[in-house]
């Protein structure tokens, strides 16, 4: 399974659709900066085997994909785009499921990578938790945006590696 | 290896016009501002403006509005700071630098070697 | 605008000395505060930011503190290469402001 190429494609196409989504000037929305603590630990290329790798990116794009689906997101952004990023995403998950039941059984994984997925789900429990705290403001979905799109970066930047070790 | 490298220096009369550039390398251009700060011989540093290369928004310091332009070309991962009509006044060094935009992460943690600039008749 | 007054704008200082510089916000600014450190002829260099947070490939004799209006930039222990220029800038809104430095010199 050729999964550094395949993924690396879909993210760079999610991050292409996520920057064309803003609605609002960034520059209004400073203050709501926040430390969500994105998990780099986990995606962390040198602990990790390329199976592990394909775990966690599985979580990322399935709690991106929740969080994008509420019918609070829906009210957010452009119904048009947000469609397709629905599209991608969900042909991504498609890509990876099919290579982490390729790469190593379904019940191993789950039971050699419960620590990362654990994490990946505790900061998309943060990422929540800040909207509903900002009551799903525009400038706090701006600040949401923003990181969902330098975690995408992040794991695309990480694939490159993969790929370089196959 | 991220860089910002900035233009060499100008000498130019009053009046004229001018365009210094910071190009940006080793990271993804479009996932950080940048932005522009003056320092004036001897003096501190003053913030003149952001702009945010993945679609050209702008903010400028009230001190600045009107006075510079600040654009970029996201193609050759440029940022531009411009002046229509050049005052003695605004002899100093001027520096690009890179910000996280809305991410949680380090401001202005690379910054351009420094354009200086130097208006007189 | 937020208004950033740094204090001492300059002091005298022994190598081993520990020197501390604060600043205040004229307005809360949480902990959305960065300080730099400048040396002459060069281009100013990040050393602390969130208000405590420690830049890669800084030394750790330098620390940060506060939150709301009240911050301090710490050297525990100055070295040589530590005689500069420091500056702290908020992060908070803009227009981003700089305070108007200290200078550190040698005793």
């Known amino acids: 399974c050729d999964l550094p190429q395949t993924h690396s494609l879909g993210n760079r196409r999610a991050l292409i659709l996520l920057a064309q989504m803003g609605r609002i000037s960034h520059f209004s929305c400073l203050k709501d900066r926040y430390d969500f603590g994105f998990p780099q630990e986990v995606f962390d290329g040198n602990q990790f085997q390329k199976a592990q790798a394909i775990s966690a990116f599985h979580e990322m794009i399935q709690q991106t994909f929740n969080l994008f689906s509420t019918k609070d997101s829906s009210a957010a952004w452009d119904e048009t785009l947000l469609d397709k990023f629905y599209i991608e995403l969900f042909q991504q998950l498609n890509d990876l499921e099919a290579c982490v039941t390729q790469e190593v059984g379904v019940e191993e994984i789950a039971l050699m990578n419960e620590d990362s997925i654990l994490a990946v789900r505790k900061y998309f429990q943060r990422i929540t938790l800040y909207l509903m705290g900002k009551k799903y403001s525009p400038c706090a979905w701006e600040v949401v945006r923003a990181e969902i799109m330098r975690s995408f970066s992040f794991s695309t930047n990480l694939q490159k590696g993969l790929r370089r070790k196959d | 290896e991220v860089q910002l490298v900035q233009s060499g220096a100008e000498v130019k009369k009053p009046g004229e016009s001018l365009k210094i550039s910071c190009k940006g390398s080793?990271?993804?251009?479009?996932?950080?501002?940048i932005g522009w700060v003056r320092q004036m011989p001897g003096k501190g540093l003053e913030w003149m403006g952001i702009?945010?290369?993945?679609?050209?928004?702008?903010a400028y310091s009230p001190s600045f509005q009107g006075q510079v332009t600040i654009s970029a070309d996201k193609s050759i991962s440029t940022a531009y700071l411009q002046w229509s009509s050049l005052k003695a006044s605004d002899t100093a060094m001027y520096y690009c630098?890179?910000?996280?935009?809305?991410?949680?992460?380090?401001?202005?943690?690379?910054w351009g070697q420094g354009t200086l600039v130097t208006v007189s008749s | 605008d937020i208004q950033m007054t740094q204090s001492p704008s300059s002091l005298s200082a022994s190598v081993g000395d520990r020197v501390t510089i604060t600043c205040r916000a004229s307005?809360?600014?949480?902990?959305?505060l960065n300080w730099y450190q400048q040396k002459p002829g060069k281009a100013p260099k990040l050393l602390i930011y969130?208000?405590?947070s420690l830049q890669s490939g800084v030394p750790s004799r330098f620390s940060g503190s506060g939150s709301g209006t009240d911050f301090t930039l710490t050297i525990s222990s100055l070295q040589p290469e530590d005689f500069a220029t420091y500056y702290c800038?908020?992060?908070?809104?803009?227009?981003?402001?700089f305070g108007q430095g200290t200078k550190v010199e040698i005793k």
């Open positions: 630098a890179r910000h996280p935009g809305l991410n949680w992460a380090p401001d202005f943690d690379y």
């Open positions: 080793g990271y993804s251009f479009t996932s950080y501002w």
């Open positions: 702009i945010d290369p993945s679609d050209s928004d702008t």
């Open positions: 307005q809360s600014i949480d902990r959305a």
């Open positions: 969130f208000a405590s």
């Open positions: 800038q908020q992060s908070f809104d803009f227009p981003l402001t």
